[in-house]
């Protein structure tokens, strides 16, 4: 039972940490212009991934996409690489953890199956958490070393009469939610890890028969062997690595004693 | 059509109140902001206040503390509630709409003039 | 608060020939997310309200005729009428529609020579 739920809490945690990465990936504020002891302007500029935009007083929002490719800076090439491969990641991770859960029973896929592909989820959660976490994170330094570098020249006179305010720019909404959502993701990720290993059955010497209780089409298996159903052709014993007696509805699982993680 | 018609000028002592109104018709107050500038007489323009279409105001040094803008949506109109008034704000007042997009006022009402004297 | 500047205080020109209009802020109105600049100009004739002639620094209000454009950015911006006719004889006033508060420039008078 509680692998079953830590896989599925897993699951959930990784869900909502990747919408978050998909949402702060298509988010426009991952930058905005710093307010603090700035002249008030009316006129409000905020940047994302694919677009700047600015907001004026009257309400109007103007969006203009990077419409670029070779022009745009290589950080900024650099973090989109890592929050799509980071989407791509995670989306491969829930589809495949999709069939890796305990309480989703498709066709006679064995216990060994679903902790492979729950291994394989967890991994995958775990980079797209860290990709994402990484994109975020060089955007934020990006941002505090040209924010410094702006406030160091930020006024440039001429001639002592005339200045230009330099735009500063701070964190955007979009840095906080991509963190917390590579937060969840990369914790989800580690849950299906942990519950990887109570999925993955002992491995044992012995070999066991599989005895076919009489009206009942379900074969009990008291060893190293996998019960199936009287449904479909599936009647070969099929060799697991499963450490007691167990029905294939039973939620109870044992620790493994392979690492996986 | 845009228009927009100012009352409530008159004769005031230094001191005293004053409330200005502006009826706005042809636009809705949600969508476009308001402004309330004014001019000494003989002399240049000077921008009071603004009501943002959200509610939001921003105010003219000379003024802040002492002058309020406000709105009534159902209305459709604009205020200017002016207190501790001095000679130097003897001027004819005006609204007028922001157009939206870059900043700029682009339809005004023909004013109303605020006489500060003793 | 932004200072601005115009100049000359006061123009005569003869009819059909081009006047020009400086102003100079002393902030730059260059929005550096759109590349655009928040002035516009205005025209007041005696006894009149004021008339937005153009906004954002070069574009021109719908029904102000072709002979008036605006130019400039950042600090410094003109405004020219290319051929002064009887009705161009006001006041014309630019102002800063970037920083608060919107600050007016303090006018400049063409009269016809």
């Known amino acids: 039972m509680a692998v079953t739920a830590c896989q599925g809490l897993g699951f959930v945690v990784s869900l909502i940490g990747i919408a978050g990465i998909i949402a702060a990936t298509c988010m426009d504020q991952w930058s905005t212009q710093d307010l603090y002891n700035n002249p008030v302007t009316a006129v409000f500029n905020y940047q994302g991934l694919w677009r700047s935009c600015v907001r004026e007083s009257s309400g109007f929002t103007e969006c203009r996409g990077y419409f670029t490719l070779l022009g745009l800076p290589a950080m900024l090439q650099a973090v989109r690489a890592l929050m799509i491969v980071g989407i791509v990641l995670g989306a491969i991770g829930l589809l495949v953890s999709i069939f890796a859960l305990k309480c989703i029973r498709i066709g006679s896929m064995e216990d060994s199956a679903k902790a492979n592909m729950t291994l394989t989820s967890g991994i995958m959660f775990i980079v797209s958490g860290l990709c994402a976490i990484a994109g975020v994170s060089v955007f934020a330094n990006m941002l505090v070393t040209n924010f410094w570098m702006s406030t160091a020249n930020m006024y440039t006179g001429m001639g002592g009469m005339v200045q230009t305010v330099q735009t500063r720019y701070t964190f955007g909404a979009a840095l906080f939610v991509g963190w917390v959502a590579g937060g969840l993701t990369l914790i989800g990720g580690v849950m299906m890890c942990i519950a990887c290993r109570g999925l993955a059955p002992e491995e044992t010497n012995y070999k066991a028969v599989s005895y076919h209780a009489s009206g009942h089409s379900v074969a009990y298996k008291p060893g190293g062997f996998k019960a199936s159903t009287g449904f479909g052709s599936n009647t070969k014993n099929k060799k697991i690595y499963d450490g007691g007696a167990r029905t294939e509805d039973e939620v109870q699982s044992y620790p493994s004693k392979h690492d996986y993680v | 059509q845009v228009q927009l018609v100012e009352s409530g000028g008159g004769v005031v002592q230094p001191g005293r109140s004053l409330r200005l109104s502006c009826a706005a018709s042809?636009?809705?107050?949600?969508?476009?902001?308001v402004y309330w500038v004014r001019q000494a007489p003989g002399k240049g323009l000077e921008w009071v206040a603004v009501?943002?279409?959200?509610?939001?105001?921003n105010y003219a040094d000379s003024v802040k503390g002492r002058f309020t803008i406000s709105k009534d949506n159902s209305k459709s109109t604009l205020y200017l509630q002016m207190n501790s008034l001095r000679a130097e704000d003897t001027a004819v007042y005006y609204c007028?709409?922001?157009?939206?997009?870059?900043?700029?006022?682009?339809?005004w009402g023909q004013g109303t003039l605020v006489t500060v004297s003793s | 608060d932004i200072v601005m500047t115009q100049s000359p205080d006061s123009l005569a020109v003869s009819l059909g020939e081009r006047a020009t209009i400086n102003c100079k802020s002393s902030?730059?109105?260059?929005?550096?997310?759109?590349?655009?600049?928040?002035l516009a100009w205005y025209q007041q004739k005696p006894g009149q309200p004021p008339k937005l002639l153009i906004y954002?620094?070069?574009t021109r209000e719908s029904g102000v005729p072709d002979r008036f454009s605006g130019s400039g950015s950042g600090t410094d911006f003109t405004l020219t009428i290319s051929s002064l006719q009887a009705e161009d004889v006001a006041v014309y006033y630019c102002?800063?529609?970037?920083?608060?508060?919107?600050?007016f420039g303090q006018g400049t008078k063409v009269e016809i020579k």
């Open positions: 007028a709409r922001d157009r939206g997009r870059l900043l700029a006022m682009d339809y």
């Open positions: 042809g636009f809705t107050l949600t969508s476009y902001g």
């Open positions: 009501v943002w279409a959200g509610g939001n105001t």
């Open positions: 902030q730059s109105l260059l929005n550096s997310g759109n590349q655009k600049n928040y």
């Open positions: 954002g620094a070069s």
């Open positions: 102002q800063n529609d970037y920083f608060f508060p919107f600050t």
